[in-house]
C-alpha cells in the first residue's frame, strides 16, 4: 500500500540495462512499488531472458508494457512484453514503443503534434500561473499540443530517464519521479540483487556513471550483509 511505501525508508536497487552491465549510463531507473508508479526492478539479458511478472505498465522497462502473454489468457498472470512498433495494433499508449502513442488502436508516431507522456523541461516549466496546469504534467494520459524538445533539468518531473538531460536519470521521489544526477565515482549507490524481494522503493538513487559500477566498498567486506556499503567504482 501507499502507506507502507511512504513510511518505508528503504532505498532499493536500480536495474542495469537490457543485456548490459550494471551501472551503465544507458540504463534507466525502474519504477518501484508504491504510490504513483507501482512496480519492481528487473534484470534480464538477451541470452538468459526470464519473463518479468508485473501488475502495471510502470513495472516494466521503457520498451515494454504489462500484459497477459496470450490472448484471452489468465488475467492474473501478466508479464512484461516488448513494446509495439509503429503501425502495430494497440489498446493503450503504454503498449507502443517510446516515440509513439496509441491512436484508434494503432501505434503512431508522437511527432504528429502528440506526446506520449514523456515529460520534458518545457512542460514542467510551463506550470502556469496560480494552478493553471497543476504541475504541468499528466501522469497517465497523452499530452496533446506542440512537441517539446528541451530535456528535463535536475528536479524536473519525468516518466523515464530519456526525459532527462544528459547526466541525469529519472528516479522516484515519494509520490513522484524526478530527474536526479547520475552517480559519480565514490558516491553511495544501491546494489541490485537479481533474485529475491522487489522491496518497496520510495527514494531511488540513479545508476553509476559511465565507466563506473556499483560495488561493495573494500573496507566494508567484513561488515554484515545488511550493512555493506556500495559505492560507484572504476571497472
Amino acid at each position: 500500500t501507499l502507506n507502507s511505501v511512504l513510511n518505508s525508508n528503504a532505498i532499493k536497487n536500480l536495474p542495469p540495462p537490457l543485456g548490459g552491465a550494471a551501472g551503465h549510463p544507458g540504463s534507466a531507473v525502474s519504477a518501484a512499488p508504491g504510490i504513483l508508479y507501482p512496480g519492481g526492478n528487473k534484470y534480464q539479458t538477451i541470452d538468459n531472458y526470464q519473463p518479468y511478472p508485473c501488475a502495471e505498465d510502470e513495472e516494466c522497462g521503457t520498451d515494454e508494457y504489462c500484459a497477459s502473454p496470450t490472448r484471452g489468457g489468465d488475467a492474473g498472470v501478466q508479464i512484461c512484453l516488448a513494446c509495439r512498433k509503429r503501425r502495430k495494433r494497440c489498446m493503450r499508449h503504454a503498449m507502443c514503443c517510446p516515440g509513439n502513442y496509441c491512436k484508434n488502436g494503432i501505434c503512431v508516431s508522437s511527432d504528429q503534434n502528440h506526446f506520449r507522456g514523456e515529460i520534458e523541461e518545457t512542460i514542467t516549466e510551463s506550470f502556469g500561473n496560480d494552478h493553471s496546469t497543476l504541475d504541468g504534467y499528466s501522469r497517465r494520459t497523452t499530452l496533446s499540443s506542440k512537441m517539446y524538445h528541451t530535456k528535463g533539468q535536475e528536479g524536473s518531473v519525468c516518466l523515464r530517464s530519456s526525459d532527462c538531460a544528459s547526466g541525469l536519470c529519472c528516479a522516484r521521489h515519494f509520490w513522484s519521479k524526478i530527474c536526479k544526477p547520475v552517480l559519480k565515482e565514490g558516491q553511495v549507490c544501491t546494489k541490485h540483487r537479481r533474485k529475491g524481494s522487489h522491496g518497496l522503493e520510495i527514494f531511488q538513487r540513479c545508476y553509476c556513471g559511465e565507466g563506473l559500477s556499483c560495488r561493495i566498498q573494500k573496507d566494508h567486506h567484513q561488515a554484515s550483509n545488511s550493512s555493506r556499503l556500495h559505492t560507484c567504482q572504476r571497472h
Epitope: 501507499l2 494552478h131 497543476l134 504541475d135 535536475e154 521521489h173 509520490w175 513522484s176
Partner: antibody, heavy 117, light 107 residues
Framework: QVQLVQSGAEVKKPGASVKVSCKAS????????MHWVRQAPGQRLEWMGV????????SYNQKFKGRVTITVDKSSSTAYMELSSLRSEDTAVYYC??????????WGQGTLVTVSS | DIQMTQSPSSLSASVGDRVTITCRAS??????LNWYQQKPGKAPKLLIY???RLHSGVPSRFSGSGSGTDFTFTISSLQPEDIATYYC?????????FGQGTKLEIK
Amino acid sequence: QVQLVQSGAEVKKPGASVKVSCKASGYTFTEYTMHWVRQAPGQRLEWMGVIDPSNGDTSYNQKFKGRVTITVDKSSSTAYMELSSLRSEDTAVYYCSSTTGPWFASWGQGTLVTVSS
Amino acid sequence: DIQMTQSPSSLSASVGDRVTITCRASQDISNYLNWYQQKPGKAPKLLIYYKSRLHSGVPSRFSGSGSGTDFTFTISSLQPEDIATYYCQQVHTLPPTFGQGTKLEIK
C-alpha cells in the same frame, strides 16, 4: 484551470470528528495525488497525509496516525479528510493540495475548523 | 522528523531593498527544498522548488540557493506586493516539514 474548492468552516466540540471535503476540477482527478496540510493560528504548516485517488492508497504523518482518514469519491472528484478525537489544539485551517512533484503547487482555499467546548 | 529553522522570524525592509531569508535543516536534505509565499487569509503559493527552480509565473526577482543543510531565499528588489510570510519546506524525508515562517513587512 485547476481548482480545488473546500467545504465551509466548522465548529466542533472536543472529542468529536470533522470531515472536510475538497472538490477538484480542471484536471483528471485520478492523475494527481491529493495532500492535506493544516495550519494552526500563528503556526507553521503541517503535512497530514496523502492519497492516490487512482487506487485509494494513503499515507499519513505518524503524528496523526489513527486519528486522520483521507478518502476520495472518484465519481464526484472529491477528496475528504476526517479527523477524529478532536482537541483544542486541532483548531486550524485545513488545506487540500493536489500535485505530482515533491512540492505543493495547487491549493484549496482552506477550511477553518474550530474546536471549542 | 527533519526540523526546519528559518531566520529571521520577521523582518522589515523598504521597497527596492534586497531581502534575504535563511532556512536551516536539521540534517542534509540535498536540494529537496521548496519555498512558499503566504498572504493573510490565503493559501500558500509555491515560488521555488528543488532549491532554486522558479515556479512558472513567479517573478525573477525571487531566487533560491544553498545545498545540504543551509539554504537562502532572496528577493532582489522588494516590491509592495511581496509583503507576506515565507515558508521553506523540505521534501527529502517523509513527512515533509515546513519552517516556522518569516514575516516580511515594509518599512
